[in-house]
């Protein structure tokens, strides 16, 4: 899987939408987790409602909110009041028993300054770009780049 880079502004919200095959993932809960180390585990931040039929209801853990549109095949995660330390590698996951299938890898990048304070062209200069069905940013002051990151080792 490629890594999607999403940029958000400190203090604002960032919304991530991970798409998936609704039939394949029928009945499965979804989760949002943060990678803990170079090769470390992914620590669960928040997961959808325990009753799958109620997955559309928003579940919150601190400043992170998740909700799943199981018919459309889209799980949406909102990171509210972004902090610099929220930057890092995350995953959207589909849960089946104790197993977790990675739907999307996301690099969250947090910027300090309003975009008009910098040359927007300097923010992202794509070097490698690839298309895939995955996370899309839905926040007006964010940048979205779908890119292939090298291994983090």
């Amino acid at each position: 899987l490629n890594t999607t880079v999403l940029q958000g502004m400190a203090g604002q919200s960032l919304r991530v939408s991970c798409t998936y095959d609704a039939l394949k993932h029928w009945g499965r809960r979804k989760a949002w987790c943060r990678q803990l180390g170079e090769e470390g585990p992914c620590q669960r931040v928040v997961s959808t409602h325990g009753v799958w039929l109620l997955a559309f209801l928003k579940k919150r853990n601190g400043s992170t909110v998740i909700a799943d549109d199981t018919l459309a095949g889209t799980v949406t995660i909102t990171l509210k009041n972004l902090q610099a330390g929220d930057a890092g590698l995350y995953q959207c996951q589909s849960l089946r028993g104790r197993e977790a299938e990675v739907l999307q890898k996301v690099l969250v990048e947090v910027l300090e300054d309003p975009l008009d304070d910098q040359d927007a062209g300097d923010l992202w200069v794509p070097e490698e770009s690839s298309s895939f069905e995955g996370a899309q940013v839905e926040h007006s002051t964010s940048r979205n780049q779908e890119t292939s990151f090298p291994p983090t080792s």
């Epitope: 940029q7 803990l36 610099a84 890092g88 990048e109 300097d122 200069v125 890119t147 090298p150 983090t152």
Partner: antibody, heavy 120, light 107 residues
Framework: QVQLVQSGAEVKKPGASVKVSCKAS????????MHWVRQAPGQGLEWMGW????????NYAQKFQGRVTMTRDTSISTAYMELSRLRSDDTAVYYC?????????????WGQGTLVTVSS | EIVLTQSPATLSLSPGERATLSCRAS??????LAWYQQKPGQAPRLLIY???NRATGIPARFSGSGSGTDFTLTISSLEPEDFAVYYC?????????FGGGTKVEIK
Amino acid sequence: QVQLVQSGAEVKKPGASVKVSCKASGYTFTGSYMHWVRQAPGQGLEWMGWINPNSGGTNYAQKFQGRVTMTRDTSISTAYMELSRLRSDDTAVYYCARGPLYHPMIFDYWGQGTLVTVSS
Amino acid sequence: EIVLTQSPATLSLSPGERATLSCRASQSVSSYLAWYQQKPGQAPRLLIYDASNRATGIPARFSGSGSGTDFTLTISSLEPEDFAVYYCQQLSTYPLTFGGGTKVEIK
């Protein structure tokens, strides 16, 4: 093993610019962030900003906005920090420090430091 | 910007003793706090991140705790190589800031 090797000491006059380099080895250069941190003689640490070598994207501390420029050359795995309009209080050791992709705002490996002296 | 206040400024202890260093933030930084060690003439070294996670290769005698505004770095039994200056760093809010440091010296 991860290594960050910085360029040598510099002596500059007030108003001039300085460009410090940081050559990375032992890991994939474009797979981590690079920060710059400075330390005035006998003082504490001061963060200046970061560059994402994969994209060239930067984020600078407001204090240095307009005076600092961070760039990179991925072909030689090297990051650069240029500071312009130097003043005497810019005299410091300048460090590059890696920010791992999983937690980009921590500094897990550091260069050896470059002493920049600003004096007329 | 968030101000980090470290105390004490200097800690005089003997090898084998326990060292307790404090870092207080001017506003909450959640658990987004790191600790670094710096020896004279050397670059800092990451010890702890996210308040309590030991960095790769850091001995178990180093531990961190706290959240919000009050944080502690504990060295359970000082080794000769532990005498150095220790800095805390918050990574919650831009600009990233460091404390003024605590010097751990041999008594």
